[in-house]
Protein backbone atom coordinates (compact mmCIF):
# COMPACT_ATOMS: atom_id res chain seq x y z
CA UNK A 1 0.00 0.00 0.00
CA UNK A 2 1.80 3.23 -0.78
CA UNK A 3 0.03 6.64 -0.04
CA UNK A 4 2.65 8.65 -2.74
CA UNK A 5 4.13 10.56 0.73
CA UNK A 6 7.27 9.74 2.74
CA UNK A 7 7.37 10.91 6.58
CA UNK A 8 10.22 11.31 8.56
CA UNK A 9 10.59 12.18 12.08
CA UNK A 10 12.84 14.57 12.84
CA UNK A 11 14.27 15.36 16.70
CA UNK A 12 17.07 18.27 17.58
CA UNK A 13 18.43 20.12 20.26
CA UNK A 14 18.07 23.97 20.01
CA UNK A 15 20.50 24.39 22.83
CA UNK A 16 20.46 28.35 23.12
CA UNK A 17 16.90 28.40 24.32
CA UNK A 18 15.80 27.97 27.79
CA UNK A 19 12.53 25.51 27.25
CA UNK A 20 9.55 27.04 29.67
CA UNK A 21 6.29 26.34 30.36
CA UNK A 22 4.95 28.65 27.72
CA UNK A 23 6.25 26.47 25.05
CA UNK A 24 3.40 24.00 26.28
CA UNK A 25 0.81 26.58 24.91
CA UNK A 26 0.37 27.08 21.29
CA UNK A 27 -1.48 30.40 22.10
CA UNK A 28 1.95 31.91 23.28
CA UNK A 29 3.47 34.70 21.21
CA UNK A 30 6.96 32.27 22.58
CA UNK A 31 5.11 29.21 21.10
CA UNK A 32 4.20 30.92 18.02
CA UNK A 33 7.36 32.43 17.25
CA UNK A 34 9.39 29.05 17.59
CA UNK A 35 7.26 27.42 15.52
CA UNK A 36 7.23 29.92 12.63
CA UNK A 37 10.79 30.10 13.02
CA UNK A 38 11.18 26.71 12.40
CA UNK A 39 8.34 26.05 9.66
CA UNK A 40 10.24 28.88 7.29
CA UNK A 41 13.66 27.19 8.33
CA UNK A 42 12.23 24.08 7.37
CA UNK A 43 10.82 25.68 3.70
CA UNK A 44 14.51 27.06 2.81
CA UNK A 45 16.42 24.24 4.27
CA UNK A 46 14.11 21.76 1.71
CA UNK A 47 13.32 24.37 -0.80
CA UNK A 48 14.05 21.58 -3.97
CA UNK A 49 10.74 20.53 -5.11
CA UNK A 50 9.41 16.99 -3.01
CA UNK A 51 9.19 18.98 0.22
CA UNK A 52 5.43 18.69 1.42
CA UNK A 53 5.28 20.25 4.79
CA UNK A 54 5.76 19.67 8.50
CA UNK A 55 3.40 18.65 11.19
CA UNK A 56 3.36 17.56 14.58
CA UNK A 57 5.54 19.82 16.29
CA UNK A 58 6.58 19.05 19.42
CA UNK A 59 8.74 21.35 22.05
CA UNK A 60 10.29 19.22 25.25
CA UNK A 61 13.12 20.52 28.13
CA UNK A 62 16.17 19.08 26.98
CA UNK B 1 17.55 23.94 26.02
CA UNK B 2 14.34 23.02 24.10
CA UNK B 3 14.30 19.80 22.43
CA UNK B 4 12.09 19.70 18.72
CA UNK B 5 10.10 16.92 17.52
CA UNK B 6 8.31 16.88 13.93
CA UNK B 7 7.55 15.26 11.33
CA UNK B 8 8.15 16.01 7.81
CA UNK B 9 6.29 15.05 4.25
CA UNK B 10 7.91 14.25 1.13
CA UNK B 11 6.50 13.15 -2.39
CA UNK B 12 7.70 9.86 -2.39
CA UNK B 13 10.67 9.46 -3.64
CA UNK B 14 12.35 12.41 -3.82
CA UNK B 15 14.73 11.84 -1.10
CA UNK B 16 16.21 9.07 1.18
CA UNK B 17 16.78 9.40 5.19
CA UNK B 18 20.32 9.93 4.43
CA UNK B 19 19.59 13.36 2.61
CA UNK B 20 16.84 14.26 5.11
CA UNK B 21 19.64 14.17 7.68
CA UNK B 22 22.43 15.70 5.90
CA UNK B 23 20.44 18.82 4.30
CA UNK B 24 19.54 19.57 7.79
CA UNK B 25 22.94 19.81 8.94
CA UNK B 26 24.15 21.48 6.43
CA UNK B 27 22.25 24.35 7.12
CA UNK B 28 22.45 24.42 10.83
CA UNK B 29 25.43 27.35 10.19
CA UNK B 30 22.61 29.43 8.21
CA UNK B 31 19.77 28.47 11.16
CA UNK B 32 22.60 29.79 14.11
CA UNK B 33 22.58 33.03 11.58
CA UNK B 34 19.62 33.62 10.65
CA UNK B 35 17.10 32.49 13.38
CA UNK B 36 19.62 32.60 15.70
CA UNK B 37 18.72 28.84 16.57
CA UNK B 38 21.82 26.56 17.77
CA UNK B 39 21.05 23.12 16.47
CA UNK B 40 22.63 20.30 17.95
CA UNK B 41 22.25 16.18 18.29
CA UNK B 42 19.87 15.47 14.76
CA UNK B 43 18.26 12.71 15.06
CA UNK B 44 16.17 11.36 11.80
CA UNK B 45 14.12 8.55 11.18
CA UNK B 46 11.21 6.82 8.87
CA UNK B 47 7.92 7.03 10.37
CA UNK B 48 5.86 3.56 9.74
CA UNK B 49 3.04 3.71 7.32
CA UNK B 50 0.48 3.30 10.19
CA UNK B 51 1.37 6.64 11.78
CA UNK B 52 2.18 8.39 9.00
CA UNK B 53 -1.22 7.45 7.46
CA UNK B 54 -2.88 9.43 10.37
CA UNK B 55 -0.44 12.31 11.02
CA UNK B 56 -0.60 14.12 7.59
CA UNK B 57 1.43 16.67 6.29
CA UNK B 58 0.84 20.60 7.96
CA UNK C 1 29.07 12.93 -23.70
CA UNK C 2 29.90 12.48 -19.80
CA UNK C 3 33.24 10.84 -19.51
CA UNK C 4 35.08 9.63 -15.89
CA UNK C 5 38.47 8.73 -16.90
CA UNK C 6 40.76 7.23 -13.81
CA UNK C 7 43.74 7.00 -13.43
CA UNK C 8 46.25 4.19 -13.91
CA UNK C 9 47.10 1.25 -11.77
CA UNK C 10 49.28 1.03 -8.62
CA UNK C 11 51.44 -0.69 -6.92
CA UNK C 12 51.94 0.28 -3.49
CA UNK C 13 53.42 -1.79 -0.11
CA UNK C 14 52.01 -2.28 2.96
CA UNK C 15 51.57 1.17 4.93
CA UNK C 16 51.80 3.06 2.16
CA UNK C 17 49.35 5.76 1.02
CA UNK C 18 47.46 5.36 -2.86
CA UNK C 19 45.51 8.64 -4.44
CA UNK C 20 43.47 7.41 -7.48
CA UNK C 21 41.94 10.22 -9.96
CA UNK C 22 38.88 10.70 -11.76
CA UNK C 23 38.61 12.99 -14.22
CA UNK C 24 35.26 13.87 -15.59
CA UNK C 25 33.94 15.66 -18.25
CA UNK C 26 30.82 16.63 -20.26
CA UNK C 27 29.15 18.43 -17.12
CA UNK C 28 29.09 20.56 -14.58
CA UNK C 29 31.52 18.90 -12.33
CA UNK C 30 30.05 21.20 -9.45
CA UNK C 31 26.13 19.58 -9.69
CA UNK C 32 26.54 16.07 -8.86
CA UNK C 33 27.76 14.15 -6.21
CA UNK C 34 31.25 11.81 -7.15
CA UNK C 35 31.04 8.37 -4.92
CA UNK C 36 34.25 5.50 -4.86
CA UNK C 37 33.07 2.12 -4.90
CA UNK C 38 36.00 -1.03 -4.73
CA UNK C 39 36.06 -4.17 -6.09
CA UNK C 40 38.71 -6.52 -4.56
CA UNK C 41 39.43 -9.36 -7.26
CA UNK C 42 36.66 -12.16 -7.65
CA UNK C 43 34.52 -10.14 -5.03
CA UNK C 44 31.41 -7.81 -4.95
CA UNK C 45 31.27 -4.25 -4.52
CA UNK C 46 31.59 -1.93 -1.65
CA UNK C 47 30.59 1.47 -1.33
CA UNK C 48 33.58 3.97 0.24
CA UNK C 49 32.14 7.13 0.00
CA UNK C 50 31.38 10.46 -1.54
CA UNK C 51 31.82 13.96 -2.26
CA UNK C 52 29.32 17.15 -3.23
CA UNK C 53 32.14 18.76 -4.97
CA UNK C 54 29.74 22.07 -5.22
CA UNK C 55 29.48 22.28 -1.28
CA UNK C 56 33.05 19.67 -0.53
CA UNK C 57 30.47 17.66 1.83
CA UNK C 58 31.98 14.23 2.24
CA UNK C 59 30.67 11.33 4.11
CA UNK C 60 32.34 8.00 3.75
CA UNK C 61 31.52 4.90 5.36
CA UNK C 62 32.36 4.21 8.60
CA UNK C 63 34.63 1.12 8.00
CA UNK C 64 37.02 3.27 5.90
CA UNK C 65 36.80 6.77 8.48
CA UNK C 66 40.14 6.80 9.80
CA UNK C 67 41.99 5.80 6.14
CA UNK C 68 40.31 7.65 3.13
CA UNK C 69 40.21 10.74 2.31
CA UNK C 70 37.84 11.99 -1.16
CA UNK C 71 38.94 15.95 -2.10
CA UNK C 72 37.71 17.35 -5.50
CA UNK C 73 39.42 19.96 -7.58
CA UNK C 74 36.50 22.15 -8.58
CA UNK C 75 39.22 23.84 -11.56
CA UNK C 76 40.17 20.75 -13.05
CA UNK C 77 36.87 18.83 -12.66
CA UNK C 78 38.47 16.22 -10.75
CA UNK C 79 37.62 14.22 -7.55
CA UNK C 80 40.19 12.17 -5.77
CA UNK C 81 39.97 8.96 -3.42
CA UNK C 82 43.26 8.39 -0.60
CA UNK C 83 43.95 5.46 1.16
CA UNK C 84 45.90 5.44 3.91
CA UNK C 85 47.97 2.63 5.44
CA UNK C 86 47.56 -0.05 2.92
CA UNK C 87 47.02 -3.47 3.81
CA UNK C 88 47.04 -6.70 1.38
CA UNK C 89 42.94 -6.67 1.15
CA UNK C 90 43.20 -3.46 0.06
CA UNK C 91 44.10 -4.65 -3.67
CA UNK C 92 40.77 -4.00 -5.55
CA UNK C 93 39.76 -2.39 -8.56
CA UNK C 94 38.71 1.41 -7.50
CA UNK C 95 35.80 2.79 -8.77
CA UNK C 96 34.47 6.18 -9.16
CA UNK C 97 30.83 6.68 -9.47
CA UNK C 98 28.45 9.71 -10.62
CA UNK C 99 25.34 9.72 -8.97
CA UNK C 100 22.53 11.35 -10.76
CA UNK C 101 21.40 14.84 -10.28
CA UNK C 102 18.36 16.17 -7.72
CA UNK C 103 15.89 13.07 -6.04
CA UNK C 104 18.21 10.33 -8.88
CA UNK C 105 19.65 8.08 -6.35
CA UNK C 106 21.50 6.05 -8.55
CA UNK C 107 25.09 5.73 -9.88
CA UNK C 108 24.65 6.62 -13.89
CA UNK C 109 27.84 6.77 -15.14
CA UNK C 110 31.53 5.13 -13.83
CA UNK C 111 34.71 5.18 -14.17
CA UNK C 112 37.09 2.92 -15.91
CA UNK C 113 38.31 1.53 -12.84
CA UNK C 114 41.79 1.95 -11.49
CA UNK C 115 43.64 -1.13 -10.17
CA UNK C 116 45.51 -1.03 -6.99
CA UNK C 117 48.07 -3.62 -5.86
CA UNK C 118 48.88 -3.91 -2.26
CA UNK C 119 52.34 -6.46 -1.95
CA UNK C 120 55.35 -6.52 0.28
CA UNK D 1 23.86 -0.79 8.63
CA UNK D 2 21.43 -2.29 6.21
CA UNK D 3 22.66 -5.57 4.76
CA UNK D 4 21.69 -6.69 1.21
CA UNK D 5 21.33 -10.56 0.35
CA UNK D 6 20.88 -11.55 -2.44
CA UNK D 7 19.89 -15.21 -4.21
CA UNK D 8 20.84 -16.78 -6.13
CA UNK D 9 24.85 -16.01 -6.02
CA UNK D 10 25.09 -17.85 -9.46
CA UNK D 11 22.67 -19.29 -11.72
CA UNK D 12 22.56 -21.32 -15.17
CA UNK D 13 19.90 -20.95 -17.66
CA UNK D 14 18.67 -21.40 -21.06
CA UNK D 15 18.59 -18.62 -23.93
CA UNK D 16 15.26 -17.62 -23.86
CA UNK D 17 14.34 -18.36 -20.50
CA UNK D 18 12.33 -16.10 -17.61
CA UNK D 19 15.19 -15.38 -14.94
CA UNK D 20 14.64 -14.16 -11.78
CA UNK D 21 17.34 -12.73 -8.90
CA UNK D 22 15.91 -11.76 -5.41
CA UNK D 23 17.28 -8.95 -3.19
CA UNK D 24 16.54 -8.93 0.67
CA UNK D 25 17.25 -6.00 2.51
CA UNK D 26 17.26 -6.28 6.49
CA UNK D 27 15.33 -3.19 6.93
CA UNK D 28 12.63 -1.13 4.90
CA UNK D 29 14.57 0.57 2.21
CA UNK D 30 11.36 2.36 0.79
CA UNK D 31 12.52 1.31 -3.16
CA UNK D 32 15.08 3.23 -3.16
CA UNK D 33 16.92 -0.03 -4.63
CA UNK D 34 18.92 0.12 -7.50
CA UNK D 35 20.36 -2.66 -9.91
CA UNK D 36 23.47 -3.19 -12.10
CA UNK D 37 24.64 -5.45 -14.30
CA UNK D 38 28.55 -6.00 -14.88
CA UNK D 39 30.27 -8.18 -17.06
CA UNK D 40 34.00 -9.46 -16.93
CA UNK D 41 36.45 -6.65 -16.94
CA UNK D 42 34.42 -4.30 -17.26
CA UNK D 43 32.51 -1.46 -14.85
CA UNK D 44 29.03 -1.61 -14.00
CA UNK D 45 26.39 -0.60 -15.43
CA UNK D 46 22.93 0.96 -13.99
CA UNK D 47 20.32 -1.27 -15.33
CA UNK D 48 16.83 -0.32 -12.98
CA UNK D 49 16.26 2.53 -10.13
CA UNK D 50 13.89 3.07 -7.99
CA UNK D 51 13.52 -0.61 -8.00
CA UNK D 52 11.28 -0.54 -11.20
CA UNK D 53 12.34 2.38 -13.62
CA UNK D 54 14.43 1.20 -16.57
CA UNK D 55 17.08 2.81 -17.42
CA UNK D 56 17.10 4.32 -21.37
CA UNK D 57 18.62 2.30 -23.42
CA UNK D 58 18.37 -0.82 -21.25
CA UNK D 59 16.03 -3.51 -23.19
CA UNK D 60 12.47 -3.79 -22.04
CA UNK D 61 13.14 -7.78 -21.15
CA UNK D 62 14.56 -6.32 -17.65
CA UNK D 63 11.85 -5.11 -15.31
CA UNK D 64 12.07 -4.53 -11.40
CA UNK D 65 9.49 -4.85 -8.90
CA UNK D 66 9.25 -4.81 -5.08
CA UNK D 67 8.80 -2.86 -2.23
CA UNK D 68 9.91 -2.67 1.52
CA UNK D 69 12.47 -5.35 2.15
CA UNK D 70 12.16 -7.39 -1.13
CA UNK D 71 13.11 -7.22 -4.50
CA UNK D 72 13.28 -8.99 -7.84
CA UNK D 73 14.71 -8.48 -10.97
CA UNK D 74 13.47 -10.11 -13.96
CA UNK D 75 15.10 -10.85 -17.34
CA UNK D 76 12.03 -12.39 -18.97
CA UNK D 77 13.27 -13.78 -21.91
CA UNK D 78 17.12 -14.86 -21.68
CA UNK D 79 20.04 -13.64 -24.30
CA UNK D 80 23.50 -14.29 -24.78
CA UNK D 81 24.68 -11.04 -23.92
CA UNK D 82 22.68 -11.04 -20.41
CA UNK D 83 25.64 -13.31 -19.06
CA UNK D 84 27.41 -11.28 -16.75
CA UNK D 85 27.00 -10.25 -13.05
CA UNK D 86 24.17 -8.74 -11.01
CA UNK D 87 23.63 -6.63 -8.30
CA UNK D 88 21.52 -4.25 -6.16
CA UNK D 89 22.14 -1.29 -4.30
CA UNK D 90 20.39 0.31 -0.99
CA UNK D 91 20.34 3.57 -2.11
CA UNK D 92 18.18 4.34 1.08
CA UNK D 93 20.94 5.04 3.46
CA UNK D 94 24.43 5.11 4.24
CA UNK D 95 26.59 3.13 3.89
CA UNK D 96 25.10 2.31 0.44
CA UNK D 97 25.60 -1.33 0.61
CA UNK D 98 25.30 -3.85 -2.53
CA UNK D 99 24.24 -6.92 -2.51
CA UNK D 100 27.09 -10.01 -3.14
CA UNK D 101 26.10 -10.23 -6.51
CA UNK D 102 24.44 -13.31 -8.47
CA UNK D 103 26.45 -14.87 -11.30
CA UNK D 104 24.15 -15.58 -14.20
CA UNK D 105 26.00 -18.03 -17.01
CA UNK D 106 24.07 -19.63 -20.11
CA UNK D 107 23.71 -23.63 -19.83
Known amino acids: LSTGVSFFFLSFHISNLQFNSSLEDPSTDYYQELQRDISEMFLQIYKQGGFLGLSNIKFRPG | SVVVQLTLAFREGTINVHDVETQFNQYKTEAASRYNLTISDVSVSDVPFPFSAQSGAG | QVQLVQSGAEVKKPGASVKVSCKASGYTFTTYTMHWVRQAPGQGLEWMGY????????HYNQKFKDRVTITADKSASTAYMELSSLRSEDTAVYYC?????????????WGQGTLVTVSS | DIQMTQSPSSLSASVGDRVTITCRASGNIHNFLVWYQQKPGKSPKLLIYNAKTLTSGVPSRFSGSGSGTQYTLTISSLQPEDVATYYCQNFWNVPFTFGQGTKLEIK
Open chain 3, 97 to 109: ARQGNYAAYYFDY
Open chain 3, 51 to 58: INPGSDYT
